[in-house]
Interface confidence: low
């Protein structure tokens, strides 16, 4: 069951899934001047069995001008830089740390993909929040949100996080700890 809405927005924070539940879809979006190849799937789908999950389909973008040329999936460094989410991805480095049954890892970038990834999450998905650079996390509880089904409707739980204007960003689960929080709890205590 797909979640009807996006995860909640937290001021000065971004969210990230550590792993994606089977059934999650990722739109194959291309940046300006490029389009999805005509034979290509419009989305990638996390599928699998009890032992292994992976993304079905590959996103491929081709130049709108050169219709015959199919771009390779392997991203070039300059194209990776253009992705707004690249900073977050490079901070995370979570894909290699995660192997949850029934979940897919973060798909690698494809050449000329759009600047923001659009995921369609399914019920049971957890996303984790991190304050953006220059803001520090104040935790009242878990800095995470879970898509739940209640009375036949999907809803996201409210993450207990406030981002205040200081220098150190908070961390997603599994990241190295740069420093302790003022209350003595490590910043990475967001998924417990």
């Amino acid at each position: 069951e797909l979640c009807d809405d996006d995860p909640p927005k937290i001021t000065h924070a971004t969210f990230k899934a550590v792993a994606y539940k089977e059934g999650t879809m990722l739109n194959c979006e291309c940046k300006r001047g490029f389009r999805r190849i005509k034979s290509g799937s419009p989305y990638m789908l996390c599928t699998g069995n009890s032992s292994h999950s992976s993304w079905d389909n590959q996103c491929q973008c081709t130049s709108s001008a050169a219709r015959n040329t199919t771009k390779q999936v392997t991203p070039q460094p300059e194209e990776q830089k253009e992705r707004k989410t690249t900073e977050m991805q490079s901070q995370m480095q979570l894909a290699d740390q995660v192997s949850l049954p029934g979940h897919c890892r973060e798909p690698p970038p494809w050449e000329n993909e759009a600047t923001e990834r659009i995921y369609h999450f399914v019920v049971g998905q957890t996303v984790y929040y991190q304050c953006v650079q220059g803001y520090r996390a104040l935790h009242r509880g878990p800095a995470e949100s879970v898509c739940k089904m209640t009375h036949g409707k999907t809803r996201w739980t409210q993450p207990q996080l406030i981002c205040t204007g200081e220098t150190e960003p908070s961390q997603f689960p599994g990241e190295e700890e740069p420093q302790a929080s003022p209350d003595g709890l490590p910043e990475s205590e967001t998924s417990r």
């Epitope: 996006d6 005509k38 989305y43 659009i118 369609h120």
Partner: nanobody, 127 residues
């Protein structure tokens, strides 16, 4: 479930302008590509314009290029179709449509690609 409600249709003289609005509710508006289609009397439903989730891609039917402008306001969950220099052949019922399929920059979508539709608003252009 996504609900779409169009408004702004009416009777206008040739050369005039109208602005159609489409209010979306009940779903993840930000992730959906939005389109306008129209059906003239006795004709098939035809593509008019579409806009991608990030407003990066906008597509238009050849017949409306340079006259119609599609836009969206994700904050208000609205999609608009500004129609200028209207012609009698623009007379039709105009439908707002939404779907989760990414919009490719030079492949005009077909009606079958869209999962969600409004009830339509009548536009009549008199000569």
């Amino acid at each position: 479930q996504v609900q779409l409600v169009e408004s702004g249709g009416g009777l206008v003289q040739a050369g005039g302008s109208l602005r159609l609005s489409c209010a979306a509710s009940g779903g993840t508006f930000r992730t959906r590509n939005m389109g306008w289609f129209r059906r003239a009397p006795g004709k098939e439903r035809e593509f008019v314009a579409a806009v991608s989730w990030n407003v990066d891609n906008k597509l238009y039917a050849d017949s409306v290029k340079g006259r119609f402008t599609i836009s969206r306001d994700n904050g208000r969950n609205m999609v608009y179709l500004q129609m200028n220099s209207l012609k009698p052949e623009d007379t039709a019922v105009y439908y707002c449509a939404a779907d989760n399929i990414p919009l490719s920059s030079d492949m005009r979508p077909t009606a079958t690609e869209y999962d969600y539709w409004g009830q339509g608003t009548q536009v009549t252009v008199s000569s």
